[in-house]
Interface confidence: medium
């Protein structure tokens, strides 16, 4: 089970995406906001240092909208 | 026990591209992050970059423009591509393992490999 | 430069206690992302020591141990004996460079 704070990192990274994200499927990385131009990658953000459920969910693909 | 060797040219002219495998051996590549490191000669370690087995990877932004990271699972292989090396890329290239237990730090690495770039 | 910093060269004779410090910013150590010391004896890879902070991998003795606070965290050797002549380098990741960054290096003289 997934607590709420710790690191994750490899496979169990992606099962947990898997899990969080559900049928949406997950990015590895979120592009450059408009503050920095960098992009984050959640391998960076929950495996060398601890993330929470919250963060997680911010991976998750948006669902196609149905007409 | 996971063991990592890196092999490849250990002369490469100034200009060209420098190639690195390393092989991994007593454990399969999928399910954890591999890096690239390097170590001028007499000077500290440089990370070169790292990356997932399912496509994610990570270069260092110094050398992101000449570095490729390569995997071939069905060989248990990574590779590092360095192109148009000058004198400053003469360094020991190691490859090491980063793994979840660990927290992200670098638990497996191997004996290295000297790289000299001279025409 | 480095960003990560640590002192060129410490020192200690056998038995005493020694400890290295390793000086980041708030866009690394500061951010929260976990701190990784290294130990290479001469001519060999290098060995990981301490993981995320204050780990230490099995096999490696409790003489070492490592911390961390705010922006810095430093490595212990207690015990100091000459096998742990050697350079001993911190890693963490800086999200400013979106990268995995190392300390300069310490060099460390048994007396």
């Known amino acids: 089970a997934y607590r709420p704070s710790e690191t994750l990192c490899g496979g169990e990274l992606v099962d947990t995406l898997q899990f969080v994200c559900g049928d949406r499927g997950f990015y590895f990385s979120r592009p450059a906001s408009r503050v920095s131009r960098r992009s984050r990658g959640i391998v960076e953000e929950c495996c060398f240092r601890s993330c929470d459920l919250a963060l997680l969910e911010t991976y998750c693909a948006t669902p196609a909208k149905s007409e | 026990q996971v063991q990592l060797q890196e092999s490849g040219p250990g002369l490469v002219k100034p200009s060209e591209t420098l190639s690195l495998t390393c092989t991994v051996s007593?454990?399969?590549?999928?399910?954890?992050?591999w890096s690239w490191i390097r170590q001028p000669p007499g000077k500290g370690l440089e990370w070169i970059g790292y990356f997932f087995y399912s496509g994610y990877t990570n270069y260092n932004p110094s050398l992101k423009s000449r570095v490729t990271i390569s995997v071939d699972t069905s060989k248990n292989q990574f590779s590092l591509k360095l192109s148009s090396v000058t004198a400053a890329d003469t360094a020991v290239y190691y490859c090491?393992?980063?793994?979840?237990?660990?927290?992200?730090?670098?638990?497996?690495w191997g004996q290295g490999t000297t790289v000299t770039v001279s025409s | 430069q480095s960003v990560l910093t640590q002192p060129p060269s410490v020192s200690g004779a056998p038995g005493q206690r020694v400890t290295i410090s390793c000086t980041g910013r708030?866009?690394?150590?500061?951010?929260?992302?976990?701190v990784h010391w290294y130990q290479q004896l001469p001519g060999t890879a290098p060995k990981l020591l301490i993981y995320g902070n204050s780990n230490r991998p099995s096999g490696v003795p409790d003489r070492f141990s490592g911390s961390k606070s705010g922006t810095s965290a430093s490595l212990a050797i207690t015990g100091l004996q000459a096998e742990d002549e050697a350079d001993y380098y911190c890693q963490s990741y800086d999200s400013s460079l979106s990268g995995s960054v190392f300390g300069g290096g310490t060099k460390l003289t048994v007396l």
């Open positions: 007593g454990g399969s590549i999928s399910s954890y992050y």
């Open positions: 090491a393992r980063i793994t979840g237990t660990t927290k992200g730090g670098m638990d497996v």
């Open positions: 708030s866009s690394n150590i500061g951010a929260g992302y976990d």
